[in-house]
Interface confidence: medium
């Protein structure tokens, strides 16, 4: 299981009309459910139950966005509509270029994602937990324009923020 280096860029408008970007680096793991590839796209937060709906009109963008899913404690969803792997597949079917799962509340999901699949997804499926997951969800919950860049090498110039 390789380390996934995730840069999350939050865009905040400035009075000049351009934007200040705040870049946060965090690490996760590429799961065996998907490919060990770089990916980038606008973050779309997805509720685990939202991935149950099989309505084709519920897909998001044709182009690659990064789905972020915070998994709940298994006790809160004793009979899930889909396995975690199934949820990853559904997100990719809807156009996600990558899926990031916050597994902090559901660590058993790691094993599910890492079970050797005969047909792994062609897009990365990353999981994060602990402090990295908290950092990610803090940004996602701001509901501002945020972008994720997933790399399998550390970014060359990690920065806390830069002004555009």
């Amino acid at each position: 299981k390789e380390t996934a280096f995730v840069e999350v860029v939050l865009f905040e408008s400035s009075p000049s009309g351009d934007y200040t970007t705040y870049t946060t680096g965090l690490t996760g793991r590429f799961s065996r459910a998907g490919a060990t590839l770089s990916a980038e796209g606008e973050i779309v937060q997805m509720h685990p139950l939202g991935l149950c709906n099989n309505n084709d009109e519920e897909d998001l963008y044709e182009y690659g966005w990064v789905g972020v899913v915070k998994l709940e404690q298994p006790e809160l969803d004793p009979k899930p509509c889909l396995t975690v792997l199934g949820k990853a597949k559904r997100a990719v079917q809807r156009g996600a270029t990558a899926v990031i799962f916050d597994v902090s509340e559901n660590p058993e999901a790691i094993d599910q994602l890492n079970q050797g699949s005969e047909d792994p997804l062609k897009r990365p499926v990353v999981y994060v937990k602990g402090a990295d997951a908290i950092k990610l969800m803090n940004i996602v919950n701001k509901q501002k324009v945020a972008r994720a860049r997933i790399q399998h090498r550390p970014p060359r110039q990690p920065t806390e923020y830069f002004d555009m």
Epitope: Y19, E42, D59, L60, F162
Partner: antibody, heavy 120, light 109 residues
Framework: EVQLAESGGGLEQPGRSLKLSCAAS????????MAWVRQAPTRGLEWVAS????????YYRDSVKGRFTVSRDNAKSTLYLQMDSLRSEDTATYYC?????????????WGQGTLVTVSS | DIVLTQSPALAVSLGQRATISCRAS??????????MHWYQQKPGQQPKLLIY???NLAFGIPARFSGSGSGTDFTLTINPVQADDITTYYC????????FGGGTRLELK
């Protein structure tokens, strides 16, 4: 102030190649997705291609897939469009455009355009 | 492709309200995102972004421009119309690929 300056247009024969360039200034080029959009009097505005910030992800309209290649040099703040196997229907004014911040849904800023004419 | 239909021309009086419509061949509203955007193009110039995601005013655009709509029907409103606004307006969707409407020419009554 955001400035996008296209160059490289001109008259070319069908089947030949042309390379367009777009020099960007007034913003941090590497932070933005970029695109090419064309406009012909007969067909109106048509999105041609987009490239995301790092240059590793590209998208094309169906009619140019396999013929056109969009690329970027972040160090030079320059966007390119390599056009091969040109067809008469590629005749248009080609605009370089900066996508919206953090999103490749809309085109926030446009250059003045460069005219490409494909004719024998 | 999603086809965007605009009426070719609209006649207005200066100081009045102009309502330009754009109809999509299928819904461009997905998960709360209205993926419709509006541009102005003056003769001999490049297009200029006015409104993104249906109702967000682009930076530097006067507040007399506004956008609304969801699903398949979207509207660009100019109120009040000024002489400088007499030009062509295009809608653009980003639900599937990116396509533009044919444009609506604003004309003086």
């Amino acid at each position: 102030e955001v400035q996008l300056a296209e160059s490289g247009g001109g008259l070319e024969q069908p089947g030949r190649s042309l390379k367009l360039s777009c020099a960007a200034s007034g913003f941090t080029f590497s932070n933005y997705d970029m695109a090419w959009v064309r406009q012909a009097p007969t067909r109106g505005l048509e999105w041609v291609a987009s490239i995301l910030t790092s240059g590793g992800t590209t998208y094309y309209r169906d009619s140019v897939k396999g013929r056109f290649t969009v690329s970027r040099d972040n160090a030079k703040s320059t966007l390119y469009l390599q056009m091969d196997s040109l067809r008469s229907e590629d005749t248009a004014t080609y605009y370089c455009a900066r996508h919206g911040v953090g999103s490749y849904d809309w085109f926030a800023d446009w250059g003045q355009g460069t005219l490409v004419t494909v004719s024998s | 492709d999603i086809v965007l239909t605009q009426s070719p021309a609209l006649a207005v009086s200066l100081g009045q309200r102009a309502t330009i419509s754009c109809r999509a061949s299928q819904s461009v509203t997905i998960s709360g995102y209205n993926l419709m955007h509006w541009y102005q193009q003056k003769p001999g110039q490049q297009p200029k972004l006015l409104i993104y995601r249906a109702s967000n005013l682009a930076f530097g655009i006067p507040a007399r421009f506004s956008g609304s709509g969801s699903g398949t029907d979207f509207t660009l409103t100019i109120n009040p119309v000024q002489a400088d606004d007499i030009t062509t307006y295009y809608c653009q969707q980003s639900r599937k690929s990116r396509t533009f409407g044919g444009g609506t020419r604003l004309e003086l009554k």
